[in-house]
Amino acid sequence: MMTGTIETTGNISAEKGGSIILQCHLSSTTAQVTQVNWEQQDQLLAICNADLGWHISPSFKDRVAPGPGLGLTLQSLTVNDTGEYFCIYHTYPDGTYTGRIFLEVLESSVAEHGARFQIP
């Protein structure tokens, strides 16, 4: 029976050109984490394997850094990075747990507290 739960950083609204950290944490289970995959839509960004360590997909090598921990750092954000990101925990014996984080990348004048909504 799968008893674990995934906690995430929560959704993030960030400025174009900036960087953010995506993190997930698996709790409430004693299952062993064998691998964590980070994906966006259907694209694999990175893998952290318990034995082999990190592998970053070649197309993201310039802008994606491993960590902290099992998290992922995205740098030099562009509007194209807006979307849903998945942390997929492969565990034994439980199976797979998935967390979801939505990243919204905005022009710097409207990100986070600057957002006023009136700007067309």
């Epitope: 929560g10 959704n11 609204s13 979307g83 409207v110 957002a115 909504f117």
Partner: antibody, heavy 117, light 112 residues
Framework: EVQLQQSGPELVKPGASMKISCKAS????????MSWVKQSHGKNLEWIGL????????SYSQKFKGKATLTVDKSSTTAYMELLSLTSEDSAVYYC??????????WGQGTSVTVSS | DVVVTQTPLSLPVSFGDQVSISCRSS???????????LSWYLHKPGQSPQLLIY???NRFSGVPDRFSGSGSGTDFTLKISTIKPEDLGMYYC?????????FGGGTKLEIK
């Protein structure tokens, strides 16, 4: 002036599929995400999902995966939601709403969908 | 999914009253950067919902200052300082911090 103009009411048969349109004007269509919300008769609001017009990327509530498909046509600044294999449970008013920083600031007028044989 | 609980379900008022609506979430709505995506909407009969407050306490453009939002973590409040006829309807809170976004069950503001 920001406007979201939705297509008109629909009466459809069980098992059929249909598509609702949401024509956006008065703002940069690709600068915001577009959310869709369901309100069953006299019931609460439910978030169906959203689409990113800039990339076409989507995010769905698990409950509506396989039921709703979101698309956009950037050239006509129109968002679409297709509802599949309709049943009486899908009878509702559906809204599109412009969203940014995880809130919905402008809403369409709503499209009433009635599923009946 | 994050469960959002609104109280009360129904709120009978007289014009001129001050009222509060509560919204509680099953987990914290603050993300790792300290931002909280909690918004409030008014849905009047025959109309589309309208945004009142976003980011806990920011009033949307054109929303009167008799509406105010407050709270943090899992507990949030919408206050209306002086009820007017145009304020009647269903009020909803929405959390957008966690996927999927989830609405509260609504609070019906009606005349006593």
């Amino acid at each position: 002036e920001v406007q979201l103009q939705q297509s008109g009411p629909e009466l459809v048969k069980p098992g059929a599929s249909m598509k609702i349109s949401c024509k956006a004007s008065g703002y940069s269509f690709t600068g915001y995400t577009m959310s869709w919300v369901k309100q069953s008769h006299g019931k609460n609001l439910e978030w169906i999902g959203l689409i990113i017009p800039y990339t076409g990327g989507t995010s769905y509530s698990q409950k509506f995966k396989g039921k709703a498909t979101l698309t956009v046509d950037k050239s006509s600044t129109t968002a679409y939601m297709e509802l599949l294999s309709l049943t009486s449970e899908d009878s509702a008013v559906y809204y599109c709403a412009r969203s940014r920083t995880f809130a919905m600031d402008y809403w369409g007028q709503g499209t009433s969908v009635t599923v009946s044989s | 999914d994050v469960v959002v609980t609104q109280t009360p379900l129904s709120l009978p008022v007289s014009f001129g009253d001050q009222v509060s609506i509560s919204c509680r979430s099953s987990q914290s709505l603050a993300n790792s950067y300290g931002n909280t995506y909690l918004s409030w909407y008014l849905h009047k009969p025959g109309q589309s919902p309208q945004l009142l407050i976003y980011g806990i306490s920011n009033r949307f453009s054109g929303v009167p200052d008799r509406f105010s939002g407050s709270g943090s973590g899992t507990d949030f409040t919408l206050k209306i300082s002086t009820i007017k006829p145009e304020d009647l309807g269903m009020y909803y809170c929405l959390q957008g911090t966690h996927q999927p976004w989830t609405f509260g069950g609504g609070t019906k503001l009606e005349i006593k």
